[in-house]
């Protein structure tokens, strides 16, 4: 029975050229976390494995940094980084928990004027 819930940073925005931390937190379960995958759509960005630690996909090595914690830091953001990001917690015995974050990367001038992305 899956009793856990994933809390995420939700819908966030960041400035082009800047960096952002993607964070998820699994709560309300005693399940053992064996691995956390970070994905953008269906592309694997990074893995944090209980035995091996972090593995960053080669195509993202220059712009993705592990942590803090089980989170992920995206650097040198571009407008193309706008989109959905998923944290996938592989746990035992519960199974797979997935959290969703929507990131909008704003042009610097827009960001300076305090625009924030919101889903109605």
């Amino acid at each position: 029975m899956m009793t856990g819930t994933i809390e995420t940073t939700g819908n966030i925005s960041a400035e082009k050229g800047g960096s952002i931390i993607l964070q998820c937190h699994l709560s309300s379960t005693t399940a053992q976390v064996t691995q956390v995958n970070w994905e953008q759509q269906d592309q694997l960005l990074a893995i944090c494995n209980a035995d091996l630690g972090w593995h960053i996909s080669p195509s993202f090595k220059d712009r993705v940094a592990p942590g803090p914690g089980l989170g992920l830091t995206l650097q040198s953001l571009t407008v193309n980084d706008t989109g959905e990001y998923f944290c996938i917690y592989h746990t035992y015995p519960d199974g797979t928990y997935t959290g969703r974050i929507f990131l909008e990367v704003l042009e610097s001038s827009v960001a300076e004027h305090g625009a924030r992305f919101q889903i109605p």
């Epitope: 053992q32 064996t34 995958n37 694997l44 209980a50 035995d51 091996l52 035992y92 199974g95």
Partner: antibody
Framework: EVQLVESGGGLVQPGGSLRLSCAAS????????MHWVRQAPGKGLEWVAF????????YYADTVKGRFTISRDNAKNSLYLQMNSLRAEDTAVYYC????????????WGQGTMVTVSS | DIQMTQSPSSLSASVGDRVTITCRAS??????LAWYQQKPGKAPKLLIY???TLQSGVPSRFSGSGSGTDFTLTISSLQPEDFATYYC?????????FGGGTKVEIK
């Protein structure tokens, strides 16, 4: 080239024991979780056990829990399945299989070793 | 445990045919379904994982779709080497469970 070669199968009496081995080559064995999966003659596939890359996570199917023990020796690139208190229903081809690095499915399998439990 | 039900259990088809196999999970497994091909006396071979992602080296005539409880494996144009048994398997939670298999035979 990724290779997984099982050995140790054979004929054993009910209540007996057997130790299966799986020799891995062609990849960094210590980076991958590993599974045992079995297939009874003429039947479908049944997952048996899993061990993570560093042995911190070990899971078993209910049908073998308490009787089978999965282990690994990363220095020897080897996976093992110690099978005790064997029953007729354990008769099957036993496959070792590698877990994908992303934890999604089993991407390479050995050729299998046959275990027959009969008196 | 999650029960995986495959249909049909067997089918007859000709080279060039479009073949569809379905797999239903007893509860939602999100996208976490794999498809394997097995030929007599051989080990299973991974075709598709996470519902629709083609394993490296697998021909593009194989495709997977679905999420939640209902999934489909499609072979767009059946080739002689595709006659085999196909298994679905959920990789959402332990114990990992397989469908009963679908045998694809020559008509």
């Amino acid at each position: 080239e990724v290779q997984l070669v099982e050995s140790g199968g054979g004929l054993v009496q009910p209540g007996g024991s057997l130790r299966l081995s799986c020799a891995a080559s062609g990849f960094t064995f210590s980076n991958f979780g590993m599974h045992w999966v079995r297939q009874a003659p003429g039947k479908g596939l049944e997952w048996v056990a899993f061990i993570s890359s560093g042995s911190s996570s070990i899971y078993y199917a209910d049908t073998v829990k308490g009787r089978f023990t999965i282990s690994r020796d990363n220095a020897k690139n080897s996976l093992y399945l110690q099978m005790n208190s064997l029953r007729a229903e354990d008769t099957a081809v036993y496959y070792c299989a590698r877990m994908r690095l992303d934890y999604y499915a089993m991407d390479y399998w050995g050729q299998g070793t046959m275990v027959t439990v009969s008196s | 445990d999650i029960q995986m039900t495959q249909s049909p259990s067997s089918l007859s088809a000709s080279v060039g045919d479009r073949v569809t196999i379905t797999c239903r999970a007893s509860k939602s497994i999100s996208k976490y379904l794999a498809w394997y091909q097995q030929k007599p006396g051989k080990a299973p071979k991974l075709l598709i994982y996470s519902g629709s992602t083609l394993q490296s080296g697998v021909p593009s005539r194989f495709s997977g779709s679905g999420s939640g409880t209902d999934f489909t494996l499609t072979i767009s144009s059946l080739q002689p080497e595709d006659f085999a048994t196909y298994y679905c398997q959920q990789h959402n939670e332990y114990p990992w469970t397989f469908g009963g298999g679908t045998k694809v035979e020559i008509k």
